[in-house]
Amino acid sequence: CDLPQTHSLGNRRALILLAQMGRISHFSCLKDRYDFGFPQEVFDGNQFQKAQAISAFHEMIQQTFNLFSTKDSSAAWDETLLDKFYIELFQQLNDLEACVTQEVGVEEIALMNEDSILAVRKYFQRITLYLMGKKYSPCAWEVVRAEIMRSFSFSTNLQKGLRRKD
């Protein structure tokens, strides 16, 4: 399983779709900006084994899928782009699950530790609570879209670390 390449290509396609989903100017929503506290340390490529990287990516993508597959999200975005985004996320999830299947035979290392996962989940909880507090306004969704783009970009740090190890 060529994880860095698989994930990198999927990530890029997901980022392009997220960019295309933007409906309103980010500048008109500056008053709604918020620091969600992305757990950057979780995606520090130097501390990862391959199995942990797989589960870190998966966690990020699954939580993003959960966030964007709600009724409120469907109302906020263009349906065609949203479906393409779902397909991209779903494909990445499948690829990552297949990576675990393929890792059998080599010594199976533990998946990502619980603290790291909880940090990612709490980050997404903060995003959900922010959206609820803002009553899922167009600007709130725009802020969240930009935030997810940023967090997807951060995971490239992990890819670089993995490439060095490979």
């Epitope: 966690e59 499948n94 699950e97 299947t101 619980e114 909880l118």
Partner: antibody, heavy 126, light 110 residues
Framework: EVQLLESGAEVKRPGSSVRVSCRAS????????ISWVRQAPGQGLEWMGR????????NYAQNFRGRITITADKSPLTAYLELSSLRFEDTAVYYC???????????????????WGQGSLVTVSS | EIVLTQSPGTLSLSPGEGATLSCRAS???????LTWYQQKPGQSPRLLIY???SRATGVPDRFSGGGSGTDFTLTISRLEPEDFAVFYC???????????FGQGTKVEIK
């Protein structure tokens, strides 16, 4: 916590079709697959197929291809199993089952069935 | 396609005794993708162990899972009266996603 509620028992003739529904409530996500698993009387569990409601993407077990159709509605989150060309050996309890969003890490979540419906008995009899 | 074979078919034991149930796969399975369920008569299955060795919420610590490759075990350290049931192992393989169950092991009161 997710609750799965299936439709009632059915009696069908050989060669006919049956449609079983499964309504999900609680902490549901259309981004997690819903599966159908059946159990013939006194027998073990057999996975039939699954659907990802957000996309309508389906995967079917080899044994059922050509006879099975799984569909879903996103709101309220409901999955449907349709099995055609029924045979006597299709007499079974049909369960819908789903993963849990709470499983850590999430990569394990879709590989298992954390929540199960109460089961729907389908009897094929002439 | 992976085949899971559980043994023994039936285990007759008394409360307080320990039980070891085996699940053998026809080819290598990731321990992360091996799950155990308990099913009592007239009830739906209940998730017990996932990821090979992690206990599901509310599952007592007398239940433990282990193994890797093709050989997996479910151990019940001291059987309680409510533990007597049928136990199933299940694996997941991708792509395409396929879920496979073992035929079950019945743990009955001696």
């Amino acid at each position: 916590e997710v609750q799965l509620l299936e439709s009632g028992a059915e009696v069908k003739r050989p060669g006919s079709s049956v449609r079983v529904s499964c309504r999900a409530s609680g902490d549901t996500f259309s981004s997690y697959p819903i599966s159908w698993v059946r159990q013939a009387p006194g027998q073990g569990l057999e996975w039939m197929g699954r659907i990802l409601p957000a996309l309508g993407v389906t995967n079917y077990a080899q044994n059922f291809r050509g006879r099975i159709t799984i569909t879903a509605d996103k709101s309220p989150l409901t999955a449907y199993l349709e099995l055609s060309s029924l045979r006597f050996e299709d007499t079974a309890v049909y369960y819908c089952a789903s993963p849990s969003a709470d499983i850590i890490p999430s990569i394990l979540g879709t590989t298992l069935f954390a929540f199960w419906g109460q089961g729907s008995l389908v009897t094929v009899s002439s | 396609e992976i085949v899971l074979t559980q043994s023994p078919g039936t285990l007759s034991l008394s409360p307080g005794e320990g039980a070891t149930l085996s699940c053998r796969a026809s080819q290598n399975v990731s321990r992360h993708y091996l799950t155990w369920y308990q099913q009592k008569p007239g009830q739906s299955p209940r998730l017990l162990i996932y990821g090979g060795s992690s206990r599901a919420t509310g599952v007592p610590d007398r239940f433990s899972g282990g193994g890797s490759g093709t050989d997996f075990t479910l151990t019940i350290s001291r059987l309680e009266p409510e533990d007597f049931a049928v136990f199933y192992c299940q694996s997941y393989h991708s792509p395409p996603p396929v879920y496979t169950f073992g035929q079950g092991t019945k743990v009955e009161i001696k």
